[in-house]
Interface confidence: medium
Amino acid sequence: LPAQVAFTPYAPEPGSTCRLREYYDQTAQMCCSKCSPGQHAKVFCTKTSDTVCDDCEASMYTQVWNQFRTCLSCSSSCTTDQVEIRACTKQQNRVCACEAGRYCALKTHSGSCRQCMRLSKCGPGFGVASSRAPNGNVLCKACAPGTFSDTTSSTDVCRPHRICSILAIPGNASTDAVCAPES
């Protein structure tokens, strides 16, 4: 970059990149200022004037330094089975998460949830695994010997059989052991 060139807009050395928070405008052939998060380019730069930035309008945002013609629209309001964990502001999009008992079946690229689904339930003989499916849904695993689950639930894990001094009925995957009364 020639030493005498410091303030935007300026013509860079051909093929060289502009500095941080600047962009190369192909039409003006200039390095020009980007707009800060929460703003957008109202007027693009020319050879003699820099980018004119303006604040994003209501329900719109930009999250990065940019030269966007318009701000991005915030995602629509969270649905009844979601909770808003981050509000829509000029600098960030709204983020919705699923309420308890639900998982996100369809995420947006920004990490918000577009569609929540009820968590799967594990039936008798199966407990909820410690890890989740890639989509966040519950994974069920068969109860190992010595453990059981007698519920249909999206939260219950396999529990150990009770330990009896005298066993009346041995437990299995879906029922607990039954102890004989002590005489």
Epitope: P2, A11, G15, Q26, T27, Q29
Partner: antibody, heavy 116, light 107 residues
Framework: QIQLVQSGAEVKKPGASVKVSCKAS????????MSWVRQAPGQGLEWMGW????????TYADDFKGRFAFTLDTSTSTAYMELRSLRSDDTAVYYC?????????WGQGTLVTVSS | EIVMTQSPATLSLSPGERATLSCKAS??????VSWYQQKPGQAPRLLIY???NRYTGIPARFSGSGSATDFTLTISSLQPEDFAVYYC?????????FGQGTKLEIK
């Protein structure tokens, strides 16, 4: 390294069309505009216009409006120059060139010969 | 359109001599002038951009000066490989235009 590789020489009859390609490599294609320059045999350089490689919007010099079309395929980092209704005075070497303010990289040129 | 007029059309000099090539614009183009060298059968090569900035890798014997309408390319001590055609071009306003060229030949 940065390269602009153009398609090979063409011999066409008057009235025909020709499409010259210019494949870019070694840099981010959509950052720099692509200019097109014509040079008739033994003559100087003529700026035909350019295409904004991010938006795809072309700009043509007055003498090159109508029969000329600049297009892009950003998926392959290739710019195209199409010339319709060829005439004998279109015989020239056609160059693609990166940028506008100080054109720093040029294709090797494509000779288009129009002859009946 | 802006007309770029180069002079002389042909310049005959010997290796080691100083070459001064002129380019005049019909209107003010600020400093939006580039200089290119072209040898037979080759594409042009960028030498100077912004009227006075030497492009990367260009030898120091090449220098550019001027602003507004009068521009000069100077080659301080000609080398055998410098004999070629030189073009100036403006990129200030559409349509961008080139001069007709100056042929630098060995005397």
């Amino acid at each position: 390294q940065i390269q602009l590789v153009q398609s090979g020489a063409e011999v066409k009859k008057p009235g025909a069309s020709v499409k010259v390609s210019c494949k870019a490599s070694g840099y981010t294609f959509t950052t720099y505009g692509m200019s097109w320059v014509r040079q008739a045999p033994g003559q100087g350089l003529e700026w035909m216009g350019w295409i904004h490689t991010y938006s795809g919007v072309p700009t043509y010099a007055d003498d090159f409006k109508g029969r000329f079309a600049f297009t892009l395929d950003t998926s392959t980092s290739t710019a195209y120059m199409e010339l319709r209704s060829l005439r004998s005075d279109d015989t020239a070497v056609y160059y693609c060139a990166r940028g506008l303010y100080g054109v720093d990289y040029w294709g090797q040129g494509t000779l288009v010969t129009v002859s009946s | 359109e802006i007309v770029m007029t180069q002079s002389p059309a042909t310049l005959s000099l010997s290796p080691g001599e100083r070459a001064t090539l002129s380019c005049k614009a019909s209107e003010n183009v600020v400093t939006y002038v580039s200089w290119y060298q072209q040898k037979p059968g080759q594409a042009p090569r960028l030498l100077i951009y912004g009227a006075s900035n030497r492009y990367t890798g260009i030898p120091a014997r090449f220098s550019g000066s001027g602003s507004a309408t009068d521009f000069t390319l100077t080659i301080s001590s000609l080398q055998p490989e410098d004999f070629a055609v030189y073009y100036c071009g403006q990129s200030y306003t559409y349509p961008y235009t080139f001069g007709q060229g100056t042929k630098l030949e060995i005397k």
